[in-house]
């Protein structure tokens, strides 16, 4: 599931983590492309313990991921739902 | 404006349930990333994480007390509630509830209630 | 279960003076930690986030770092209105940990 939202006029990311997050634990996931004074992309994760936390965006297996779960919600419903923030 | 007030008995005796209600307002657990804590302050000392409560009632405890606590929420009320079974002397503190929202920046208990003063006394 | 051990337990210091307090975690916590400042008679408030991140309407002599698994708190020139108890928190995995806190007196 795609949607569309505005973002905030900053960077939310502070620092990104770079272990691998599995599918299985991941609720959902919010990909910001720059724009609206952030001038990189940023990649939110929450998971099923209840931390949400920056990753990086260029790192293998997030593209990886990504691509599984799009593919996922063309075909049944997504594992986890993918929210995609589009700057103004 | 996020608000926090916690309520319930200032004394108790020993081996009696502590029953404590936190009701807030400004932000609802309903919405998706919300939780609600629980924390400890016995007087003079530091502070003791008790439990959290989150929107989709997924609950966390600390495991030295897990089989005393029990953590609950009524979502329409904007209450949070915490139970202690079987009270004795070492819970007399100040207890607070706090809120938790999953954003980015993270930064649980962002707001706090003024605390209410629980004493277990025979 | 995390331990952060905090130091030192208090501290006494002149208006003015550059004081740091620090919390040790006995496993990673990455950077996430909190520091609460609790001014007496009232309810924790986070002063520092994700460890060197300042808190909305905290002054800029506040200041959080981090050199391995010390974590550290400095007010760069203390006033009169810094004097409080600080506790850091681990926010890494769940049980949350606390520090067992520093008070902060002024001289």
């Known amino acids: 599931i795609l949607e569309a939202h505005y973002t905030n006029l900053k960077c939310r990311c502070s620092g990104v983590i770079s272990t691998v997050v599995g599918l299985n634990i991941i609720d959902r996931i919010q990909v910001t492309p720059p724009g609206n004074g952030c001038p990189k992309t940023e990649v939110v994760i929450w998971t099923k313990m209840k931390k949400v936390i920056c990753v990086n965006p260029r790192a293998k297996w997030l593209q990886r991921l990504l691509r599984h779960v799009q593919s996922k919600s063309l075909s049944s419903t997504p594992q986890a739902p993918v929210s995609k923030r589009r700057a103004a | 404006q996020v608000t926090l007030k916690e309520s319930g008995p200032g004394i108790l005796q020993p081996s009696q349930t502590l029953s404590l209600t936190c009701t807030f307002s400004g932000f609802s657990l309903s919405t998706y990333g919300m939780g609600v804590g629980w924390i400890r302050q016995p007087s003079g000392k530091g502070l003791e994480w008790l439990a959290n409560?989150?929107?989709?009632?997924?609950?966390y405890y600390n495991p030295s007390l897990i089989n005393r606590l029990t953590i609950s929420k009524n979502t329409s009320n904007n209450q949070a509630f915490l139970k202690i079974t079987n009270v004795d002397a070492p819970d007399t503190a100040t207890y607070y509830c706090?809120?938790?929202?999953?954003?980015?920046?993270?930064?649980?208990?962002?707001?706090w209630g003024q605390g209410i003063m629980v004493t277990v006394s025979s | 279960d995390i331990q952060m051990t905090q130091s030192p337990s208090s501290l006494s210091a002149s208006l003015g003076d550059r004081i740091t307090m620090t919390c040790q975690a006995s496993q990673d916590i990455g950077i996430e930690l909190i520091w609460f400042q609790q001014k007496p008679g009232k309810s924790p408030w986070p002063v520092i986030y994700?460890?060197?991140n300042l808190a909305s309407g905290v002054p800029s002599r506040f200041s959080g770092s981090r050199s391995g698994s010390h974590y550290s708190l400095t007010i760069s020139s203390l006033e009169s209105e810094d004097m409080a108890d600080y506790h850091c928190?681990?926010?890494?995995?769940?049980?949350?940990?606390f520090g067992s806190g520093t008070k902060l007196e002024i001289k």
């Open positions: 706090a809120r938790s929202e999953l954003v980015m920046p993270y930064v649980p208990f962002d707001f």
């Open positions: 409560i989150w929107w989709d009632d997924d609950k």
């Open positions: 994700y460890t060197a």
């Open positions: 928190l681990q926010y890494k995995q769940y049980p949350f940990t």
